[in-house]
């Protein structure tokens, strides 16, 4: 299981305000069992963007269907991007734990920059 890698192929993505941003992430293995979460920023103050395990995130949709049992594509689409969404986004794999899941491995991050809406 130590061989699992979280791959974020894009170092940076640039999106016009009002458009959608696709942030790519794949895992190289189904093991260990546990959810993927997306965060903006790193460290204790990071902002949760999407949690595969819990909740509904209205601006975020997954590119693939995560209910399919062998899915390893955890890319997300964030709608209606604004300048406030700029930052570095991390795709993070968690290992199932009790009582709480444990952070296992993070992708290298994708920097999202927001261009002014074309006039």
């Amino acid at each position: 299981e130590e061989g699992l890698q979280v791959i974020q192929p894009d170092k940076s993505v640039s999106v016009a305000a009002g458009e959608s941003a696709i942030l790519h992430c794949t895992a190289t293995s189904l093991i260990p069992v546990g959810p993927i979460q997306w965060f903006r920023g790193a460290g204790p103050g990071r902002e949760l963007i999407y949690n595969q395990k819990e909740g509904h995130f209205p601006r975020v949709t997954t590119v693939s269907d995560l209910t399919k049992r062998n899915n390893m594509d955890f890319s997300i689409r964030i709608g209606n991007i604004t300048p406030a969404d700029a930052g570095t986004y991390y795709c993070v794999k968690f290992r199932k734990g009790s009582p709480d899941d444990v952070e296992f491995k993070s992708g290298a991050g994708t920097e999202l920059s927001v261009r002014a809406k074309p006039s």
Partner: antibody, heavy 120, light 107 residues
Framework: QVQLVESGGGVVQPGRSLRLSCAAS????????MIWVRQAPGKGLEWVAS????????YYADSVKGRFTISRDNSKNRLYLQMNSLRAEDTAVYYC?????????????WGQGTMVTVSS | DTVLTQSPDSLAVSLGQRATINCGAS??????MHWYQQKPGQQPKLLIY???NLEAGVPSRFSGSGSGTDFTLTISSLQAEDVAVYYC?????????FGQGTKVEIK
């Protein structure tokens, strides 16, 4: 094997309260989101409320918002539905069901249901 | 809210024949449509998840298709034990909603 057993149903007068319970066994309860769904006599299924695995995310149907409260105790493997200010239209069989992981997942196991009758 | 409309409301099919149930959504639910079977006096049972995936233990005569707003549940060769009410349900966004149900009987 997976088991969900509801209890706490019965006959209650309008305006009164009732607390339903769902005892879970045969799986790791704390891994699953849980749902209450109801079915009025001779009618279809209506989602009532859902709660995520750690209780961080809770949603209610508009028809019960402000009157019903869903909760869970992962240490006891139990799901609850506190029903206040009951109305005649709340009369139904109440089912608990489990949902693996996040919001988009289906309800893969259901209990047998408990009947709630609201009548004066 | 996403309204789900099933058609027909009831369906009588001869044993061994194909039964088809449709579910239309008032807006796209992507592939997050699930199908349940409810036999008289029993709790619902998951048959198909995410439009086309057969739940473990469900006979292969059941299949699902569709995406977006139009979905279909097909029973390729109806058996006596398939007499039930079938419901579609979306999990694309809250609130979760169900179709009104389709009653399948033997002709």
């Amino acid at each position: 094997q997976v088991q969900l057993v509801e209890s706490g149903g019965g006959v209650v007068q309008p305006g009164r309260s009732l607390r339903l319970s769902c005892a879970a066994s045969g799986f790791t309860f704390s891994d699953y989101g849980m749902i209450w769904v109801r079915q009025a006599p001779g009618k279809g299924l209506e989602w009532v409320a859902s709660i995520s695995s750690s209780s961080s995310y809770i949603y209610y149907a508009d028809s019960v918002k402000g009157r019903f409260t869903i909760s869970r105790d992962n240490s006891k493997n139990r799901l609850y539905l506190q029903m206040n200010s009951l109305r005649a239209e709340d009369t139904a069989v109440y089912y608990c069901a489990r949902r693996y992981y996040g919001f988009n997942y289906p309800f893969d196991y259901w209990g047998q249901g408990t009947m709630v009758t609201v009548s004066s | 809210d996403t309204v789900l409309t099933q058609s027909p409301d009831s369906l009588a099919v001869s044993l061994g024949q194909r039964a088809t149930i449709n579910c239309g959504a008032s807006k796209s639910v992507r592939t997050y449509m699930h199908w349940y079977q409810q036999k008289p006096g029993q709790q619902p049972k998951l048959l198909i998840y995410s439009a086309s995936n057969l739940e473990a233990g469900v006979p292969s005569r059941f299949s699902g298709s569709g995406s977006g707003t139009d979905f279909t549940l097909t029973i390729s060769s109806l058996q006596a034990e398939d007499v039930a009410v079938y419901y579609c349900q979306q999990s694309n966004e809250p609130p979760y909603t169900f179709g009104q149900g389709t009653k399948v009987e033997i002709k």
